[in-house]
Amino acid sequence: ESALITQQDLAPQQRAAPQQKRSSPSEGLCPPGHHISEDGRDCISCKYGQDYSTHWNDLLFCLRCTRCDSGEVELSPCTTTRNTVCQCEEGTFREEDSPEMCRKCRTGCPRGMVKVGDCTPWSDIECVHKESGTKHSGEVPAVEETVTSSPGTPASPCSLSG
């Protein structure tokens, strides 16, 4: 029966080469903006604009910063503790079920419907039937005439942190 081995007993045989700015972990974890060294003895800072970490962690690496796609605007840059915040350009939106791309907002509602919600970076215009007030989901039929409207102004950021 082998004795219980503590982390001190399991001292590494080889040290990694020095990298970024270092500090000591607290209870085996490094603060946001850092990752841990292989031997668990140092916290190494993430590289500004390249990678980040948002929580206390014992990961060997920081997470790569998101790059905003074409069709997106950068609301805030990537820092060592927060990922880039990207948002769809005006007149486009990102749906929950297809978050990989920004889609063009419809320019108007089908005949017999009225617009009750503007185009935002996270939702298309919202249309309801004039009489019943029920929402319309789906594409505008090509032959139907539409009531045109200009895209709405973005109200708040849509973060793709991850």
Epitope: I36, E38, L60, F61
Partner: nanobody, 123 residues
Framework: EVQLLESGGGEVQPGGSLRLSCAAS????????MGWFRQAPGKEREFVSA????????YYAESVKGRFTISRDNAKNTVYLQMSSLRAEDTAVYYC????????????????WGQGTLVTVKP
């Protein structure tokens, strides 16, 4: 998808040697550790050794220090465990595992596991 394939297990006499291999595929992390654990019948899985990919930091359990040697082949994404002076108490199923955490000598710090290879030491 991360896959780990162990090989090299078998039956050996006390004092003999074996070399275990663990080939990894699907690993895309900037750095990671590959460790060996073992589990004897009726006992808990225990840490044996680990090696890290970038800096080559190495860990051994006290019970195997001086007898087992861990090494890696970066080009083949393979880790080896050279086991010498084997004893009856080394009999176990040996598992290869991957971690993305530092100083990982505990089972819970490992996210990916192989199926295991049986090592039997008996006269």
């Amino acid at each position: 998808e991360v896959q780990l394939l162990e090989s090299g297990g078998g039956e050996v006499q006390p004092g003999g040697s074996l070399r275990l291999s663990c080939a990894a595929s699907g690993l895309t992390f900037p750095n990671y550790g590959m460790g060996w654990f073992r589990q004897a019948p009726g006992k808990e899985r225990e840490f044996v050794s680990a090696i890290y990919w970038s800096g080559g930091t190495v860990y051994y359990a006290e019970s195997v220090k001086g007898r087992f040697t861990i090494s890696r082949d970066n080009a083949k994404n393979t880790v080896y465990l050279q086991m010498s002076s084997l004893r009856a108490e080394d009999t176990a199923v040996y598992y290869c595992a991957v971690t993305i955490r530092g100083a990982a000598t505990q089972t819970w710090k490992y996210d990916y596991w192989g199926q295991g290879t049986l090592v039997t030491v008996k006269p």
